[in-house]
């Protein structure tokens, strides 16, 4: 019995920060949960994680390579990442696990969100020499 998650397929980032929303087919306020964001095709890197329940706002903590924070309402967890660089361009997957009360529930793997960090180009206006 798996929970479904909806993510935007693509986020193109001009600045160095992004908000990624994970919308779940389950009421987050019903149970104690652990929400996380993973990077890579094989979800190798746990980017950000937060534990929460109906009585307290979760504390989000990030992998050393990332800066993150998060928020949630009754059906959506939003991860905010900042200080992003071009090499952070990758596919990101939302994951949620509901631990207490039982039974344990988690989500079906989604198609993920490709976060594309655009390289910043400094424009130099060159004055062309007069002929």
């Amino acid at each position: 019995n798996k929970i479904l998650v909806k993510q935007s397929p693509l986020l193109v980032v001009d600045s160095n920060e992004v908000s990624l929303s994970c919308r779940y087919s389950y009421n987050l306020l019903a149970k104690e949960f652990r929400a996380s964001l993973y990077k890579g095709v094989n979800s190798d890197v746990e980017v950000c994680v937060g534990n929460g329940n109906f009585t307290y706002q979760p504390q989000f903590r990030s992998n050393a390579e990332f800066n993150c924070d998060g928020d949630f309402d009754n059906e959506t967890v939003t991860f905010r990442l900042w200080n992003l660089h071009v090499n952070h361009t990758d596919i990101y997957f939302c994951k949620i696990e509901f631990m207490y009360p039982p039974p344990y529930l988690d989500n079906e793997r989604s198609n993920g969100t490709i976060i594309h960090i655009k390289e910043k180009h400094l424009c130099h206006t060159q004055s062309s020499p007069k002929l």
Epitope: M99, P101, P102, D106
Partner: antibody, heavy 120, light 111 residues
Framework: EVQLVESGGGLVQPGGSLRLSCAAS??????????VGWIRQAPGKGLEWIGE???????YYSPSLKSRVTISRDNSKNTLYLQLNSLRAEDTAVYYC????????????WGQGTLVTVSS | DIQLTQSPSSLSASVGDRVTITCRAS??????????LHWYQQKPGKAPKLLIY???SLQSGVPSRFSGSGSGTDFTLTISSLQPEDFATYYC?????????FGQGTKVEIK
């Protein structure tokens, strides 16, 4: 047949660390449906839950021990580990690993336990 | 944390007696009609053994003289006719909330 076998107990100095192992057979630690917890029992006392690990690798710890405990696993060996730091006399206990099902979280299979004595 | 209080702490009984142990939770351990309260038996020097899960379901291989009842905050373990091998310590445990907690135990001794 499901089996859990703990090892690594013995005499430890106060302030030291312990690393206990729990070798699982008859089921996979990384397959959905079950998780494994650690429970301890001080001599002549009741049972105390330490923490647990889910098939995903997610962990939950007792708030009273959270700052000193780490539960991890090695999927290739199908083995679970308990690391407990800054040991004190009150940590002297028999340490059990036990499997739980995801529907009720009841501990249906237990290891035989391993005794840890913290003393100088 | 959810506190579980068992009573009595110890009791003396004879073979064939009906024995009742109670477990009271500091808050309800029910969710969607299921009580996340379990009972274990422990003999000296041995690991605990699951007897009853979800308040009233008998674990496979456990004799039918063991039964559990209750919901919400009040639960009972009953041994209908005590056998010599039943002299042990019995614990209740809740899995409704983290941290999981156990009752302090009830020791069943021979009269």
């Amino acid at each position: 047949e499901v089996q859990l076998v703990e090892s690594g107990g013995g005499l430890v100095q106060p302030g030291g660390s312990l690393r206990l192992s729990c070798a699982a057979s008859g089921f996979s630690l990384s397959t959905g449906g079950v998780g494994v917890g650690w429970i301890r029992q001080a001599p002549g006392k009741g049972l105390e839950w330490i923490g647990e690990i889910y098939h995903s690798g997610s962990t939950y710890y007792s708030p009273s021990l959270k700052s000193r405990v780490t539960i991890s696993r090695d999927n290739s060996k199908n083995t679970l580990y308990l690391q407990l730091n800054s040991l004190r006399a009150e940590d002297t206990a028999v340490y059990y690993c036990a499997r739980y099902g995801y529907y009720y979280y009841d501990f249906d299979y237990w290891g035989q336990g391993t005794l840890v004595t913290v003393s100088s | 944390d959810i506190q579980l209080t068992q009573s009595p702490s110890s009791l003396s009984a004879s073979v064939g007696d009906r024995v009742t142990i109670t477990c009271r939770a500091s808050q309800s351990v029910d969710f969607h009609g299921i009580s996340f309260l379990h009972w274990y038996q422990q003999k000296p020097g041995k690991a605990p053994k699951l007897l009853i899960y979800a308040a009233s379901s008998l674990q496979s291989g456990v004799p039918s003289r063991f039964s559990g009842s209750g919901s919400g905050t009040d639960f009972t373990l009953t041994i209908s006719s005590l056998q010599p091998e039943d002299f042990a310590t019995y614990y209740c445990q809740q899995s409704y909330r983290s941290p999981r907690t156990f009752g302090q135990g009830t020791k069943v001794e021979i009269k």
